[in-house]
């Protein structure tokens, strides 16, 4: 259902794109539902810090606390997951730092420490002291919830003792965990009381229970594994940009669109225009004109500069960004005042054409 008609056709992709976008993977913070999460904005010399989530301004509420350079989320829910950004505004410039929040039934990544200390987990008992199994190192078992990025290695440990020496077996979701249950199988290192799974995939998600038993008893401990998936995402635009602007006839004005994308983005600046005296085509869709797009003939595509404006330049300007994954767009309004009238602060107008998100 295309919702507009382009007055001039342009390609969606740049011939030679700019390279200054943050295209690296952001840091990931993981929290379990109901937990509190605190993140510090890793930017220096910030006079004013503003926060966004998925490109939308984030303000304080009953669960979100913003204090200085800290963001606190109380009682996290999966809906708090997303791409967050803090922007430090300084007198001369601004800088943005991005990070991901993932709220799943998991609180931290798997224990990938080396088993250098494993020998002390293997406790030998005096042969006369018969004893049911017991845990020898509960500290290593406190972290029950593990969120691990896909393709990483996971290690679960159940250090135990007993006499005779207990045996260990593993269950997945309450059933016997067999080698053929996952591609590549798994390793059990009995002397370290550990289960190791390499290159985890989403199908590895679930509950893993170690059962430690001898003839005098049985104990068990369950870990929950969540595999955090990573894949490229569509562009995200900084909230509040482009900003509404006003100027007098003959003046100059700039619109700025700040982009976060982990695939090379293509930026278009689009304006509603008239054709043959009409703003809409025969299909009822608005006419749009691409004023600028990232490519070999355009300098910094994040900025649209208008010089010597006329009243005809007034209206809505859309920053539309796409990569091969998807699109995002935001718009701002330009008010052109008669020459004798000095421009004042524009009251913010929130406007979104029907075909935009």
């Amino acid at each position: 259902r295309p919702s507009f008609s382009l007055v001039e056709d342009t390609t969606l992709e740049p011939e030679e794109p700019p390279t200054k976008y943050q295209i690296s993977q952001p840091e990931v913070y993981v929290a379990a539902p109901g937990e509190s999460l605190e993140v510090r904005c890793l930017l220096k010399d910030a006079a004013v810090i503003s926060w966004t989530k998925d490109g939308v301004h984030l303000g304080p509420n009953n669960r979100t606390v913003l204090i200085g350079e800290y963001l606190q989320i109380k009682g996290a829910t999966p809906r708090d997951s997303g791409l967050y950004a803090c922007t430090a505004s300084r007198t001369v410039d601004s800088e943005t730092w991005y990070f991901m929040v993932n709220v799943t039934d998991a609180i931290s990544s798997g224990d990938d420490e080396d088993d250098t200390d494993g020998a002390e987990d293997f406790v030998s008992e005096n042969s006369n002291n018969k004893r049911a199994p017991y845990w020898t190192n509960t500290e290593k078992m406190e972290k029950r919830l593990h969120a691990v990025p896909a393709a990483n290695t996971v290690k679960f440990r159940c250090p135990a003792g007993g006499n005779p020496m207990p045996t260990m077996r593993w269950l997945k979701n309450g059933k016997e965990f067999k080698q053929e249950h996952r591609i590549g199988g798994y390793k059990v290192r009995n002397q370290h009381w550990s289960l190791i799974m390499e290159s985890v995939v989403p199908s590895d998600k679930g509950n893993y229970t170690c059962v430690v038993e001898n003839e005098y008893g049985s104990i068990n401990h369950t870990y929950h594994l969540d595999v955090v998936e990573r894949s490229p995402h569509r562009p995200i635009l900084q909230a509040g940009l482009p900003a509404n602007a006003s100027t007098v006839v003959g003046g100059d004005v700039e619109f700025v669109c700040k982009v976060y994308s982990d695939a090379q983005p293509h930026i278009q600046w689009i304006k509603h225009v008239e054709k043959n005296g009409s703003k809409y085509g025969p299909d009822g869709l608005p006419y749009l004109k691409v004023l600028k797009h990232s490519g070999i003939n355009s300098s910094n595509a994040e900025v649209l500069a208008l010089f010597n404006v006329t009243e005809a330049d007034a209206g809505e300007y859309i920053c539309k960004v796409s990569n091969y994954i998807g699109q995002a767009n935001q718009s701002a309004w330009l008010t052109v005042l008669p020459k004798q009238q000095a421009p004042g602060r524009e009251k913010e107008i929130t406007a979104s054409p029907d075909y935009l998100e």
């Epitope: 740049p14 569509r234 090379q264 796409s322 091969y324 994954i325 998807g326 998100e357």
Partner: antibody, heavy 113, light 107 residues
Amino acid sequence: QVQLVQSGAEVKKPGASVKVSCKASGYTFTNYYIHWVRQAPGQGLEWMGAIYPDNGDTSYNQRFKVRATLTADTSTSTVYMELSSLRSEDTAVYYCARAFTYWGQGTTVTVSS
Amino acid sequence: DIQMTQSPSSLSASVGDRVTITCGASENIYGALNWYQQKPGKAPKLLIYGATNLADGVPSRFSGSGSGTDYTLTISSLQPEDVATYYCQNVLSTPYTFGGGTKVEIK
């Protein structure tokens, strides 16, 4: 989980048209481009075009711009690829893919007189 | 259009070997490159996106590197299940062209 399910195999005569469907589930349909890629027997992969279901934006490989039409039905989360004026060299497996991350199972189109 | 040239077109290596496949673009693609694995009768599977990022569920023996016009896919220790054809793809600008493919076999 994300799934793309394509329509079944087709046998067509030269000059005819074929319309292949790709039904998406497990994600927000309007948020991702759906791309179409084809593979002739024993050959490599060839990108045909893409559609953004949210607004119908399309982008085509010039080689297919005249003959291929991509459409999206947001009510059923389905994308369609129609290829007209078929010739024997259009015999191939046609894949839809969500942003190249998740792929359909492929639809074999055979063009034979 | 951006041309993608893959080499070699086929290779045979032993289990445990380090395997390297290269992909050259006819112009700078700024790291906008994906790698795929395709097994006979199956759809391609995304391995690496953005030249260096491992996709979901892909074993860590796969890695991608490169910038500008030259890119590399490396399998650090070839496994029997890695037998497949591997493709690189330009995802910078349309048409999103693929390399000709590299068929990997076990000796």
